[in-house]
């Protein structure tokens, strides 16, 4: 007798007495930037502080009637979803409410900025335990709102935002598009994207994961014991804010990067029907629904990686796309993808002291994406080994020559467009284990890393027949760090990682008479961290 | 996620004869003006003036005061609604859009963003 949304994110087998106890103490504090709330509701009574913060625009219309219960509706429901004693996710968590949305649910970027600054000031005046900020609101893309979120995140605050309800690319909205924010889309009881009238949940590369957001039962401001159902990405974000509060309550030392990686790792994968999303967004949208991760005591020390997509480069000949990891994360590999196949490859380069993944468009190309594999590994130290394009002669292997360094990724690019050249093999574990192999016209970049107990291996899967994509997955206990396409007779569109699966995409020429030598191969570099062991390359 | 979304970024410059009115404003604006791509969500008349990251607290207040002074000389009244410092240096100002060109020429200004609406989701 537990509502579907709570069962979905905290499966019964994983619930502990501590997690489900509404009277348990929590050192985590959640700040909610929303409408006013009814703090006397049975769900949240005694665990909500209404701050004196109020920065809202006037309501529209001369005849607008401020009815308290309507003014409080959105915020009360969300406060209940986060920490409600019965319908809440993190039942013991204390919550602070800041009013940045008026009775019509409208606010301003400036009001939100002042609210974020208020939180920062509170943090400076009275430092406390871990802080989570829930932003169940969205406006158009705002550089300054994203910057404020970034600065607050740098102080150790975890920000969770609604992806938006516009059935659109979340990257066009703020704070959803801020990289430092955990951005949440909404799914229903069938794990499908939420439709809201003619619109629905936002999607795309700026969404980190999805969470329940349809027909969510929670506190109603109509009366102090009333409940109602509401839908939206706000409700989804509130679930994730609750999960984050529970994670921090178990392990207050978790950083934003670790929280995000663990949310991604332990989410339920591949349950969303991606056909709901526009075709060009499907590859960019994460197919994962949030669940409460187990505690770090049970799963500590493993290599955690996620895929970060860049914005689309645009179609100009010299266009580039750049994907960045979070400051704490290490860029272990870089690949690229183009729907037309016209690209000049990818490389890792340093910009402002940070390694970034760069993809290069080619003449006649419609644009490229850079795909970074961003990982968390204690005491990791990486370097890039480059081999410039040889003007003539045999293929040039690039390997990791520093002691105890292992290959985690290969990148390659051409200075000039040469689609024929792209159809040459680039990496062959059977002949040169632990090496990136380029051909005479490509610059090859090997990503070589050292960390205690880091070991890696290449895993390949080839298809000789007609195919649009080839995949290879790292087995349990191993984490995908690098992904490349080794093309056969067809033009490679590129390669990218989806969770622990390497996807090689090709434009199939439809030739069924290919020899195995011409097979298109997806090559994954799979790594694991065994802190007691020495760094090593595992020969298959 | 994103460095710049679907965004209106405009370079505004004052006519040259107006530059001579105030010596301090004589350098060409390198700062940009940004506003929401969705026109219905824009709130013209309220602007967040964002200063360079290293700008000191005192310089933020001086910059806001300088803008008020320049505006007053042109017969405009502007209201500084809030000064930001804890997350980024800048200030929120209510003023005529006529003054944007002038504001973009202020020292330390990185960009100016027009205020816009956000909505409960």
């Amino acid at each position: 007798s537990i509502p579907w949304n709570l069962e979905r994110i905290i499966p019964a087998w994983q619930q502990t007495e501590e997690d489900s106890s509404p009277d348990g103490s929590s050192q985590v504090e959640v700040y909610l930037l929303d409408t006013s709330i009814q703090s006397g509701h049975r769900e949240i009574e005694g665990r909500v502080t209404i701050t004196d913060f109020n920065s809202v625009p006037e309501e529209d219309g001369t005849r607008f009637h401020r009815q308290a219960s309507k003014c409080d509706s959105h915020g009360t429901h969300l406060a209940g979803v986060v920490s409600g004693r019965d319908a809440g996710v993190a039942k013991g968590t204390s919550l602070h409410s800041l009013r940045v949305l008026n009775c019509q649910g409208k606010g301003t970027v400036s009001g939100t900025l002042i609210g974020l600054e208020f939180i920062r000031k509170s943090q400076l005046i009275q430092p406390s335990g871990p802080l989570v900020v829930l932003l169940p609101l969205a406006g158009g893309y705002s550089r300054i709102l994203n910057t404020a979120c970034q600065r607050l995140a740098r102080t150790g605050v975890v920000l969770v935002a609604a992806a938006g309800n516009f059935r659109d690319d979340a990257c066009l909205y703020s704070p959803a598009s801020a990289p430092e924010v955990i951005t949440v889309g909404a799914t229903n009881a069938q794990d499908q994207p939420v439709t809201l009238g003619t619109l629905g949940t936002n999607f795309g590369r700026c969404v980190d994961l999805f969470a329940p957001g349809k027909d969510i039962i929670g506190a109603s401001s109509d009366c102090s014991t009333c409940y109602m159902s509401q839908s939206g990405t706000s409700q989804a974000a509130a679930h994730v804010a609750g999960i984050v509060a529970m994670m921090l309550n178990r392990d207050p030392a978790l950083t934003l990067a670790e929280l995000r990686q663990r949310l991604i790792l332990f989410s339920t994968k591949d349950v969303i029907n991606m056909a709901w999303f526009p075709e060009d967004q499907r590859v960019l949208t994460p197919n994962r629904v949030a669940t409460l991760p187990p505690s770090t005591q049970e799963t500590g020390g493993q290599l955690l990686c996620r895929t970060v997509w860049s914005a689309h480069s645009g179609p100009t000949r010299t266009a580039t796309a750049t994907a960045r990891c979070a400051p704490e994360e290490e860029l272990l590999s870089c690949s690229s993808f183009s729907r037309s196949g016209r690209r000049r490859g990818d490389r890792i380069e340093a910009i402002g002291g940070q390694q970034v993944c760069k993809a290069l468009n080619a003449f006649g190309g419609e644009g490229v994406y850079a795909v970074a594999r961003c990982c968390l590994l204690p005491r990791v130290n990486c370097s890039i080994h480059n081999t410039p394009a040889a003007r003539a002669g045999p293929q040039t292997p690039v390997h990791c020559h520093q002691k105890d360094h292992v290959l985690t990724g290969c990148s390659f690019h051409w200075e000039v467009e040469n689609l024929r050249a792209q159809q040459q093999p680039l990496l062959r574990s059977r002949h040169q284990p632990g090496q990136c192999v380029g051909h005479q016209e490509a610059s090859v970049h090997a990503s070589c890393c050292h960390a205690p107990g880091l070991e890696c291996k290449i895993k390949e899967h080839g298809i000789a027949g007609p195919a649009e994509q080839v995949t290879v997955a790292c087995e349990a206990g191993w984490t995908l760090t690098g992904c490349n396409v080794l093309p056969g007779a067809s033009l490679p569109l590129g390669a990218y990682s989806v969770d622990n699966v390497c996807v090689a995409r090709i434009r199939d020429a439809g030739r069924a008479d290919r020899t195995s030598e011409e097979a298109t191969v997806a090559a994954a570099i799979c790594c694991r961290s065994r802190p007691s062991a020495k760094a090593s390359w595992v020969h298959q | 996620q994103d460095e710049d979304g679907d965004y209106e970024e405009l370079m505004l410059a004052l006519p040259s004869q107006e530059d001579s009115l105030v010596d301090e404003a004589s350098h060409v604006a390198t700062a940009t003006f940004r506003r929401c791509s969705k026109e219905a969500w824009r709130l013209p008349g309220t602007y967040v003036v964002v200063l360079m990251e290293e700008t000191q607290r005192l310089q933020v207040e001086q910059t806001a005061h300088r803008l008020q002074t320049w505006a007053a000389r042109r017969g405009y009244v502007i209201k500084v609604l809030h000064v930001f410092y804890d997350l980024f240096p800048g200030f929120l100002v209510k003023m005529s859009s006529d003054l944007l060109g002038l504001a973009l020429k202020l020292p330390h200004v990185e960009y100016i963003e027009e205020d816009s609406l956000v909505f409960a989701q």
């Epitope: 537990i2 509404p22 004693r85 039962i217 009366c223 009333c226 109602m228 | -």
Partner: antibody, heavy 123, light 107 residues
Framework: EVQLQQSGPELVKPGASVKISCKAS????????MNWVKQSHGKSLEWIGD????????SYNQKFKGKATLTVDKSSSTAYMELRSLTSEDSAVYYC????????????????WGQGTTLTVSS | DIQMTQTTSSLSASLGDRVTISCSAS??????LNWYQQKPDGTVKLLIY???SLHSGVPSRFSGSGSGTDYSLTISNLEPEDIATYYC?????????FGSGTKLEIK
Amino acid sequence: EVQLQQSGPELVKPGASVKISCKASGYTFTDYYMNWVKQSHGKSLEWIGDINPNNGGTSYNQKFKGKATLTVDKSSSTAYMELRSLTSEDSAVYYCAGGGIYYRYDRNYFDYWGQGTTLTVSS
Amino acid sequence: DIQMTQTTSSLSASLGDRVTISCSASQGISNYLNWYQQKPDGTVKLLIYYTSSLHSGVPSRFSGSGSGTDYSLTISNLEPEDIATYYCQQYSKLPFTFGSGTKLEIK
């Protein structure tokens, strides 16, 4: 048939504590909040508080905080109310009453009542 | 706390009469009001919830109405088994509060 069977009458001395029980049958125990209501002799009803049997979450009337503690034992479908530091003011009939659980969100009433437990505090 | 007032503490009526019991709240309670019946032996039953909704198994001669702060319970055709004390109860704000009760007797 739904039944809430309360424990029998209690005669206790001032300063002592007492624990009253309410055993539910005929319905799924976790589908209803368990409320407790006090009725002093010849007086009206006073709501003491409620408990959600799913997770033990409680709400109390401020007046009874520190006086009453509500608990449940899911395995036996029984709710308990402990009253401590008893005085003659606590002499009353105490009722348990089942009210609709939160996700049946139109159910803000006490559907089923126990027969009442008479508590007498006297030296 | 919201005060619930039942001004009539006792009421005498004849069998077959139409009886109205009133209840007022110290502030608006938006129809979040229930009515209960307590028989002389102490048994308590729910009659009406949310101002006017009849609880299952309750005879249709019972009805409720009201809004804002003023509410009433009506028994259209008084029967012998209706002899009891009737309480109103609000659930607009915690704590739940009850009226002082109206005792209904037969003339």
